[in-house]
């Protein structure tokens, strides 16, 4: 008889990862006497996959009844793969021997590799708040997938981004491969309702890319702007003065009202009005008892917003000759009406 | 139902002749490697010969030269040829199917009773 | 040649009892050892092969060990079918050779 041969047909299987892959063997005789093994990569460091003569492989079946002596199919299948599995397979026929079985031919091997999906895209934006017109960094990152290439933008708003910096590793061969990449935007003050998408394709979403997003609402500060203003009044003796804090964002803010640098009132924003592009307006407002002072009041409207440092504006009011006539015996306290913000919620 | 029958067997002569027959039915006998082993009576088990897939045949010291394993496969059958008989080769002889890829003995059948006796 | 010798040649024991019969190969045999069973009159039984892979249809109480020139057979709970007598055997080279045989006999 001719000598055995080794055959396996296939140099390469590429299948999904938690699908089962079929490496393929056949042998040209069945002499001589002794096993079939399977192993990953080859050497003194390859991997038993499986022995026809002993032992338990609970993933591996043989794909034809082995204990029929005329079979001369030796493939097998392994279930359940992960890209842990990647790798070449060699088919190997031993002759039966002591103290060990002798490898007497290899076929020339099988090269299993891995289609594994990439996990979903996560998105992370800056740790602290940035203002309009400064650039902030956001990142994308996902993990697991095999092979290596794969595709990833960057989008606000369905504009696709050019500014951003994308790293597969690792560089070399892997069972599986991460993907990160950060983008850099500049912040506009119409941010607070858009959104950026980091978007991945790979040969294993059939064309259904992958998506990660993250709201600019996390990552913008819009400072508010200030306008105090006196309203009119019927009462002679009492002024009306408004602080209108527009265009902010997020919503903590605290309003102080202060006479000549004297902390009168100090309130938190609650009920706001919000904008179409997402920002808010609120008003505040304080009554004054003209009759109280004898000279001109500065009033200043400080605002802290989001724990940044305090802005303020301020409005002089002035007292007239016959106001300040009349009203030397109203102390200052008597002279504060009590306040509530105007317009409806936000 | 895989099965292997032996006939053949008898009382002979020291230096006589017998041929053993092993019919094989149930599955293909060239495809495996087959066996003869024996018991004399009251004794362990011996080895005798072994003929391979291949053609190729073994012996035990004792009987090589004497013996001779064959089988003919259109009768799906083997055969052991045993010349120059003596006294010592008195025993059960039993036809045996060698495993399918390490040769492990898995297939007995009844045996056959030789006795060489004057 | 290669000698198998078993321990011990005969063993009396009772029914449920756990009892382990030994072979020694006088030289490496890998894992090719084999055992089997035999009643007075009948042909031989193969139990095990490669040192404790199970035939077919053998039941699990009977149980195989070893490598290289030590190896034993174990029978987990002896029941009144399981009085016989054993024999090892190796069949990694020729000639093959059998153990003389321990024969197991009801106490």
């Known amino acids: 008889e001719d000598e055995l041969q080794v055959i396996q047909p296939e140099k390469s299987v590429s299948v999904a990862a938690g699908e089962s892959a079929t490496l393929r063997c056949a042998m040209t005789s069945l002499i001589p006497v002794g096993p079939i093994m399977w192993f990953r990569g080859a050497g003194a460091g390859r991997e038993l996959i499986y022995n026809q003569k002993e032992g338990h492989f609970p993933r591996v079946t043989t794909v034809s009844e082995l204990t029929k002596r005329n079979n001369l199919d030796f493939s097998i299948s392994i279930s359940n793969i992960t890209p842990a599995d990647a790798g070449t397979y060699y088919c190997v026929k031993f002759r039966k021997g002591s103290p060990d079985d002798v490898e007497f031919k290899s076929g020339a091997g099988t090269e299993l590799s891995v289609r594994a999906k990439p996990s979903a895209p996560v998105v992370s934006g800056p740790a602290v708040r940035a203002t309009p017109e400064h650039t902030v960094s956001f990142t994308c990152e996902s993990h697991g997938f095999s092979p290596r290439d794969i595709t990833l933008k960057w989008f606000k708003n369905g504009n696709e981004l050019s500014d951003f910096q994308t790293n597969v590793d690792p560089a070399g061969d892997s069972v599986s491969y991460s993907i990160h990449s950060t983008a850099r935007v500049v912040l506009t003050r119409g941010d607070v309702h858009s959104q950026v998408i980091c978007e991945i394709a790979h040969i294993t979403l059939q064309g259904d890319p992958l998506r990660g997003t993250a709201n600019l609402s996390e990552a913008i500060r819009v400072p508010p702007t200030l306008e105090v203003t006196q309203q009119p009044m019927r009462a002679e003796n009492q002024a009306n003065v408004t602080c209108q804090v527009s265009n902010f964002y997020p919503r903590g803010l605290q309003l102080t009202w202060l006479e000549n640098g004297n902390v009168s009132r100090t309130e938190t924003a609650s009920t706001l009005i919000e904008n179409k592009d997402g920002t808010y307006n609120w008003m505040s407002w304080l009554l004054v008892n003209t009759c109280a002072h004898r000279d001109d009041v500065v009033l200043t409207c400080q605002v802290e917003h989001d724990g940044q440092q305090a802005v303020s504006k301020s409005y002089a009011l002035e007292i007239s000759a016959h106001q300040k006539e009349h009203g030397s015996d109203i102390t200052h306290e008597a002279a504060l009406a009590p306040t509530a913000p105007l317009g409806g919620s936000g | 139902e895989v099965q292997l029958v032996e006939s053949g067997g008898g009382l002979v002569q020291p230096g006589g002749s017998l041929r053993l027959s092993c019919a094989a039915s149930?599955?293909?006998?060239?495809?495996?490697?087959m066996h003869w082993v024996r018991q004399a009576p009251g004794k362990g088990l011996e080895w005798v010969s072994a003929i391979g897939t291949a053609g190729d045949t073994y012996y035990t010291g004792s009987v090589k030269g004497r013996f001779t394993i064959s089988r003919e496969n259109a009768k799906n059958s083997l055969y052991l040829q045993m010349n120059s008989l003596r006294a010592s080769d008195t025993a059960v002889y039993y036809c045996?199917?060698?495993?399918?890829?390490?040769?492990?003995?898995?297939?007995w059948g009844q045996g056959t009773m030789v006795t060489v006796s004057s | 040649d290669i000698q198998m010798t078993q321990s011990p040649s005969s063993l009396s024991a009772s029914v449920g009892d756990r009892v382990t019969i030994t072979c020694r190969a006088s030289q490496g045999i890998n894992n090719y050892a084999a055992w089997f069973q035999q009643k007075p009159g009948k042909a031989p039984k193969s139990l095990i092969y490669t040192a404790s892979s199970l035939h077919s249809g053998v039941p699990s109480k009977f149980s195989g060990s070893g490598s290289g020139t030590d190896f034993t057979l174990t029978i987990s709970s002896l029941q009144p079918e399981d009085f016989a007598t054993y024999y090892c055997?190796?069949?990694?080279?020729?000639?093959?050779?059998f153990g003389q045989g321990t024969k197991l006999e009801i106490k």
């Open positions: 149930g599955f293909t006998l060239s495809s495996y490697d």
């Open positions: 045996v199917r060698g495993g399918v890829w390490d040769d492990a003995f898995d297939i």
């Open positions: 055997q190796q069949y990694v080279s020729y000639p093959y050779t």
